[in-house]
């Protein structure tokens, strides 16, 4: 689509005569008829296939034609066409005398023609005017002409339609050749694709407007390049959404089970060595002079009862000292000056002479020991309590105070963690060496199956055409990440030719 423009500049008819040679009375009131048609080697009468246009009376005899309008007419004259410009044309320009005001062809006498010119040739689309002058024996016409494209049409033949737009269907202006030139922030064949925030992750982020970065489910951060771990993940990280990969020293589905109690809590006191022995379980190896589960108790050197034969022990800064009873001597009161005659055996012990009465030995009743049966038997010396239990002397017997999770006379039995039915919503309980584990039925999760979760929205494979499915745990819905060439909430529609635009 375009316009053939003809600009009349000057008409000379010095004698004011018609083509027949007859003069006009009082002068030749001149108007023009223009016929534009397809190329003809010899221009002949017939339909003006490209269009016609007439002017009002522009002057008398000889005159110059002003630009733009003159007496209501337009200059240049416009001959629009709605087809591809062929590059060639034929042009007929007739000058007529108008005796009255009626300029219709049928209202004029046939001899009112002043002059007629016909040209033909090739003409390319362009902004430049071609100047021409045609002379006959009595008249001269100077004019120029050109072909330009209509608004929104471009190219060598005005055949390329391009209408600038900035809406859902595209964001572009048109280049001189009719190609699209995308507005800043847009790309793609029809400039419909926004250019996301610089660095926005190609798979995990997207945008609906330029310079933004919207994250797909399971991703976050300014560039949508940080995954969101599984809800409930305590001491873990992820490399893909909803994962929970445990940090060093942590275990369990949510990385909330402490496998390195020693490092995280430092329970052993007084320089003791700590050893991990399972979830929240540890053993302290005490330095000399300390005791207790956490080596929190300081031992007295007299606690080992080093003084024999009823000697009394006194703690000193650099050790201990034994005060011996009469008849005994030595560092630990181990030497005797007594015999059976002195009744040296305590607590009902019976005395036996040795070395012809120079020495003796005491035979002690149960629960007593020592060379003079002066000591009660300490039933805890053999460390009979297992699993870190604490041994307590209780009169003639002993007992073990067990740590949490253990029972039995010697704390040798592991308490069944499943005995109290800890798994909710019908979960199955499994006893482990260091705790328990719940296997949850569908629709529940958490350490104890206490969290009601939705069934995985992606389980039914709702996405088509090899699209990636993401479950959005916050809304119980799925989102399909379409591969190139597919669109739709399930990626079900192939991207065909762009929709035809309603120009």
């Amino acid at each position: 689509s375009g316009v053939f423009q003809l600009q009349l500049q000057e008409f000379i008819n010095e004698r004011g005569v018609l083509a027949s040679g007859r003069p006009c009375e009082p002068g030749c009131r001149t108007f023009f008829r223009v016929c534009l048609k397809h190329f003809q080697a010899v221009v002949s009468p017939g339909p003006c296939t490209f269009g016609t246009v007439s002017t009002p009376v522009l002057g008398t005899n000889s005159f110059a034609v002003r630009d733009d309008s003159s007496g209501g007419g337009r200059n240049p004259l416009q001959l629009p066409f709605n087809f591809t410009w062929p590059g060639t044309f034929s042009l007929i320009i007739e000058a007529w005398h108008a005796p009255g005001d009626d300029l219709r062809p049928e209202a004029l006498p046939p001899d009112a023609l002043i002059s007629k010119i016909a040209i033909q040739g090739s003409l390319a689309v362009g902004q430049n005017w071609l100047l021409d002058e045609q002379t006959s024996t009595l008249t001269r016409l100077r004019y120029s002409y050109r072909v330009i494209c209509s608004d929104n049409y471009y190219g060598d033949n005005c055949s390329r339609l391009c209408k600038k737009r900035n809406d859902h269907f595209g964001h572009y202006v048109c280049q001189p050749d009719g190609n699209l030139s995308c507005l800043p922030g847009w790309t793609g064949e029809y400039c419909q694709q926004p250019i996301c925030l610089s660095g926005c992750h190609e798979q995990n982020g997207y945008c609906s407007k330029p310079a933004e970065c919207l994250c797909r489910p399971g991703w976050q951060g300014r560039l949508c390049n940080e995954c969101i771990p599984h809800n409930g993940c305590r001491h873990g990280t992820c490399s893909t959404p909803w994962q929970c990969t445990c940090d060093e020293g942590w275990g369990g589905l949510f990385c909330d089970q402490d496998l390195n109690y020693c490092t995280h809590h430092s329970p052993c006191k007084n320089g003791a060595t700590c050893s991990n022995s399972g979830q929240r379980s540890y053993t302290c190896t005490c330095r000399p002079g300390y005791t207790g589960v956490d080596c929190e108790l300081e031992l007295s050197e007299c606690d080992s009862n080093p003084c024999r034969n009823g000697g009394s022990c006194k703690d000193q800064e650099d050790g201990y000292h034994c005060l011996c009873p009469p008849g005994y001597y030595g560092l630990h009161c181990e030497h005797s000056t007594l015999s059976c005659a002195d009744s040296p055996c305590f607590n009902g012990g019976s005395c036996r002479e040795r070395n012809q009465g120079a020495n003796y030995a005491c035979e002690c009743p149960p629960n007593f020991t020592g060379s003079n049966c002066e000591k009660k038997v300490d039933r805890c010396t053999s460390n009979p309590c297992a699993n870190g239990g604490q041994c307590l002397n209780r009169g003639p017997s002993r007992m073990c105070r067990c740590r949490p999770g253990f029972t039995g006379t010697y704390c040798e039995l592991h308490v069944s963690d499943c005995a109290r039915n800890p798994c909710a919503h019908g979960g199955t309980c499994h006893d482990l060496e260091n705790g328990l584990m719940c296997t949850c039925p569908a629709g529940f999760s958490g350490r104890r199956c206490e969290v009601r979760t939705s069934i995985d929205a992606c389980a039914s494979s709702p996405c088509f055409n090899r699209a990636t499915c993401y479950t959005d745990l916050s809304t119980d819905t799925f989102v399909c990440n379409c591969p190139y060439g597919f669109v739709g909430s399930r990626c079900e529609f192939p991207v065909g030719l762009p929709p035809s635009f309603p120009w």
């Epitope: 925030l197 945008c207 933004e212 949508c224």
Partner: nanobody
């Protein structure tokens, strides 16, 4: 169920200070980026500040840079906004929100919002 409950708003004189808190529940707070958004009467929401999940990276709108400080306590599931040198133009309802997308200057889409707390700066 995700819940965000803001508190700490009130009436304060120009130049004064306020500390806003946002208590989060129903999700693993320490795994999510968080932000503060405000809405003045008759205006649209305006992003104020944001902080990444670990708390090591913070972002501020130009209008509050140097005056406001965002922080978080993941152990207590709480987000904070310390507001100093307050101006009358800071008057708005302040919301804490989980950002879902970012623009060139800051967050621009949000997955969840709290109910908001009113801050009024006036003499």
């Amino acid at each position: 169920e995700v819940q965000l409950v803001e508190s700490g708003g009130g009436l304060v004189q120009p130049g004064g200070s306020l500390r806003l808190s946002c208590a989060a529940s129903g999700f693993t707070f320490g795994s999510y980026d968080m932000s503060w958004v405000r809405q003045a009467p008759g205006k649209g929401p305006e992003w104020v500040s944001a902080i990444n999940s670990g708390g090591g990276t913070t972002y501020y709108a130009d209008s509050v840079k140097g005056r406001f400080t965002i922080s978080r306590d993941n152990a207590k599931n709480t987000l904070f906004l310390q507001m100093n040198s307050l101006k009358p133009e800071d008057t708005a309802v302040y919301y804490c929100a989980i950002p879902r997308g970012w623009g060139p200057t800051g967050p621009l889409e949000y997955g969840y919002w709290g109910q908001g707390t009113q801050v009024t700066v006036s003499s």
